[in-house]
């Protein structure tokens, strides 16, 4: 048995070693080595028992959503929907894989992550990696060089998640994004203010948003002696300073990545920084990095933002970070990320991020990668984390033992009597034609009790009692679930007043 | 009885040839990754050279390539050093080695070593 | 190459003794590392593949652990015949290397 666990072991290793190659576009020749050498790995496992030991189970970084978190996840997204739709978005949607050639050379080191699919003879196709690029295809396809849109969707990374964090392999993002040619800073300030605005609906804890500028990291690196190629390695090492010391990001940075340890001294003095507008100042009159263009061109902007910022009202809820460095490729200008914050165990302390929420930036030129004549569409947007925000949610409501309803019914229709399953076939479809939410139970002669006992349970507030008395005198029973307080309803009124009762229009508009 | 015996070390001037040989016993020898792995004395492990089952993949280390060339013959169940323009840094015990599982390159079965010294 | 590296390079310890052997590898190597004992005049051999698994005929005293980069070797209770030279080697790719060696003798 041990020297079966030993085997399968080394399949997955050898699996992941020959997946690794692929990506990282080793000769054909070790390539099909490995590939020979997994197949004969895979031969001395022999056939298997694998139908009795077939695991029924979801695949890796993959979750099934119960009742009870679609209930959470619909509630979560109508209030992002809401927030998107009162700032004057469009909604569109993509296909769920793209052509591999659209998303190549766009995500830099998480190119690694993303799902290439099995050739079905003809076109190579990868899942989606986020919601961005699809768009930026989306834009250059059609020619569009204008457009405030949404779009909420699955999307695909071959993590390793730690799904106790929210983190999974298939994924829901929230994305919203600005196109088009506007004056400096209005756009980005209006992104800002929607993801504020969302997370403060949600009401899922204190947060901060986290704003630095590409331009600003790039001179900073340049005047700090780190040579072009490097700034997008270095950028991914810097931006783990949020989850290790400043000493374990220098140590990737000279041991790993060769910078010079001077180099990163220097640059572990600006990374270091996190401030408000006053810190903009500050560098705005640093002597070497007030002398580079890109980095002043950002130091400029990112004032005027605070400035946008403050007549938002949202100025308290944001930080200029120097640390922050998205991993992305694609940002151009401004960046910002949104991270929860742990209520600190003592007064004075710092207050504790516990992972992005929410997460944006500029990327002016992703457009003009698609256009045959590079063409640039200005581009601004921000993505919703919901899947950790799903988390928190659910791990709150199950702190507070809050009961959750999954269905939307409004009234049981029930009876008193046997022999009454027609009237209430006929009284459920007055009530569906209405457009009331409706329920009854699929059985010929149910008990009064059980009916009741599943209004309890499923959170239905009323019960339409049907009985051999009330249909002689032109009746019906209404009852309320939680008060248990009985009525009789003239039939031609029932449906106004169940809708009076459960707060519903009184038409269908 | 499962096992690997090498033979053909020797001792030879710098310049010159050598061929080590290593006969295998009670396994299918063409089910598997043979390997050549020399150790300097009083030194540690050097992987040498490998070849595939099927003859088809061989690799070199950077310190023996152009000189060293490795072979087998599955009929024969023998694996093969052909040891040219050796230097005095080749002087060391040479082990066969068979690959775990078949293809994991890590050696499970082992021969006593031949030793190979390189001196004028 | 990737390099790999032993420590300490020897250890005295007696009979009963848990002993802990530590390898680094330069970049990672996943789970693709061997351990070796080799005693004055032998050949290697195997104790664990794949950073943990216990080769065939191994005592359950030894155990591997460890993926990426840092990789143990445990011997839970020495025993007389465990005095010798343990090599870790990584098979992640070509050429494939040992570390220097750890010399384990009687204290």
């Known amino acids: 048995m041990a020297e079966r666990a030993a085997l399968e072991e080394l399949v997955k290793l050898q699996g992941e070693r020959v997946r690794g190659l692929k990506q990282q576009k080793a000769s054909a020749e070790l390539i099909e080595e490995e590939v020979a050498k997994l197949l004969k790995l895979k031969a001395q496992l022999g056939p298997d028992e694998s139908k009795q030991k077939f695991v029924l189970k979801t695949p890796k970084g993959t979750r099934d959503y119960s009742p009870r978190q679609m209930a959470v996840r619909e509630k979560v997204f109508d209030v992002i929907i809401r927030c998107f739709k009162r700032h004057g978005a469009e909604v569109i949607d993509t296909p769920v894989f793209e052509l591999k050639e659209t998303l190549m050379g766009k995500y830099g080191e998480d190119s690694k992550l993303i799902y290439d699919l099995k050739d079905q003879g003809g076109e190579l196709l990868s899942l989606r990696y986020d919601l961005t690029v699809p768009f930026a295809r989306y834009l250059a396809m059609n020619k569009l060089t204008n457009i405030k849109r949404y779009h909420i969707a699955k999307v695909y990374r071959r993590d390793n998640p730690a799904m106790t964090r929210g983190r999974y392999r298939e994924f829901y993002q929230c994305d919203f994004d600005i196109a088009g040619n506007f004056d400096p800073m209005i756009p980005d300030a209006e992104c800002l203010k929607i993801m504020c605005e969302i997370l403060s609906s949600l009401q899922i804890g204190d947060f901060l948003v986290k704003v630095n500028d590409r331009r600003i990291l790039d001179g900073m690196f340049a005047i700090c002696g780190v040579s072009d190629s490097k700034f997008r390695t270095i950028c991914s090492s810097v931006d783990k300073l949020d989850k290790v010391s400043w000493e374990e990001v220098k140590n990737e940075m000279v041991g790993e990545k060769g910078l010079a340890p001077e180099v990163a001294d220097r640059i572990g003095d600006y990374v270091q920084q996190h401030g408000g507008v006053s810190l903009v100042e500050q560098l705005l009159q640093d002597p070497k990095l007030s002398q580079n263009k890109q980095a002043l061109e950002g130091l400029g902007d990112l004032k005027l933002l605070f400035e946008y910022l403050t007549l938002f009202g949202i100025d308290d809820k944001i930080s200029f970070d120097l640390s922050l460095a998205r991993g992305l490729d694609y940002y151009t200008g401004v960046i910002y990320e949104a991270v929860l914050l742990q209520t600190p165990a003592q007064a004075g302390e710092e207050p504790l991020g516990v992972g992005s929420v929410a997460a944006g930036g500029r990327y002016d030129g992703l457009v003009g990668m698609f256009d045959p004549k590079g063409r640039k569409v200005p581009c601004v947007g921000l993505s919703i984390g919901v899947e950790r925000i799903f988390s928190i949610v659910e791990q709150r409501l199950e702190a507070l033992e809050e009961k959750i309803r999954t269905t939307e019914t409004q009234v049981l229709v029930a009876s008193a009597q046997k022999k009454l399953l027609e009237e209430r076939l006929k009284l459920v479809s007055e009530l569906w034609d209405a457009g009331i939410k409706a329920e009854l139970l699929y059985k010929k002669n149910p008990k009064l009790l059980n009916q009741l006992q599943y209004c309890e349970e499923a959170g239905i507030p009323l019960v339409a009692i049907i009985g051999e008395q009330e249909l002689k005198d032109g009746v019906i029973k209404l009852r309320s679930v939680t008060s248990r307080e009985e009525v009789d309803v003239r039939r031609e009124d029932l449906v106004e007043e169940i809708k009076r009762r459960t707060g519903q229009p009184l038409c269908i508009c | 009885q499962v096992q690997l015996v090498e033979s053909g070390g020797g001792l030879v001037k710098p310049g010159g040839s050598l061929r080590l040989s290593c006969a295998a016993s009670?396994?299918?020898?063409?089910?598997?990754?043979m390997t050549w792995i020399r150790q300097a004395p009083g030194k540690g492990l050097e992987w040498v050279s490998y070849i595939s089952g099927s003859f088809r993949y061989t690799n070199y280390a950077d310190s023996v390539k152009g000189r060293f060339t490795i072979s087998r013959d599955n009929a024969k169940n023998s694996l093969y050093l052909q040891m040219n323009s050796l230097r005095d840094e080749d002087t060391a015990v040479y082990f066969c080695?068979?690959?775990?599982?078949?293809?994991?390159?890590?050696?499970?079965?082992w021969g006593q070593g031949t030793l190979v010294t390189v001196s004028s | 190459d990737i390099q790999m590296t032993q420590s300490p390079s020897s250890v005295s310890a007696s009979v009963g003794d848990r002993v802990t052997i530590t390898c680094r590898a330069s970049?990672?190597?996943?789970?693709?590392l061997a351990w070796y004992q080799q005693k004055p005049g032998r050949a290697p051999k195997l104790l664990i593949f794949?950073?943990?698994s216990l080769q065939s005929g191994v005592p359950s005293r030894f155990s591997g652990s460890g993926s990426g980069t840092h990789f143990t070797l445990t011997i839970s209770s020495l025993q007389p015949e465990d005095f010798a030279t343990y090599y870790c080697?990584?098979?992640?790719?070509?050429?494939?290397?040992f570390g220097q060696g750890t010399k384990l003798e009687i204290k």
């Open positions: 970049q990672g190597i996943s789970s693709w």
């Open positions: 009670g396994f299918t020898f063409s089910d598997y990754y």
């Open positions: 794949a950073a943990s």
């Open positions: 080695a068979r690959y775990v599982y078949q293809v994991v390159a890590i050696g499970d079965l």
């Open positions: 080697q990584q098979a992640e790719s070509f050429p494939y290397t």
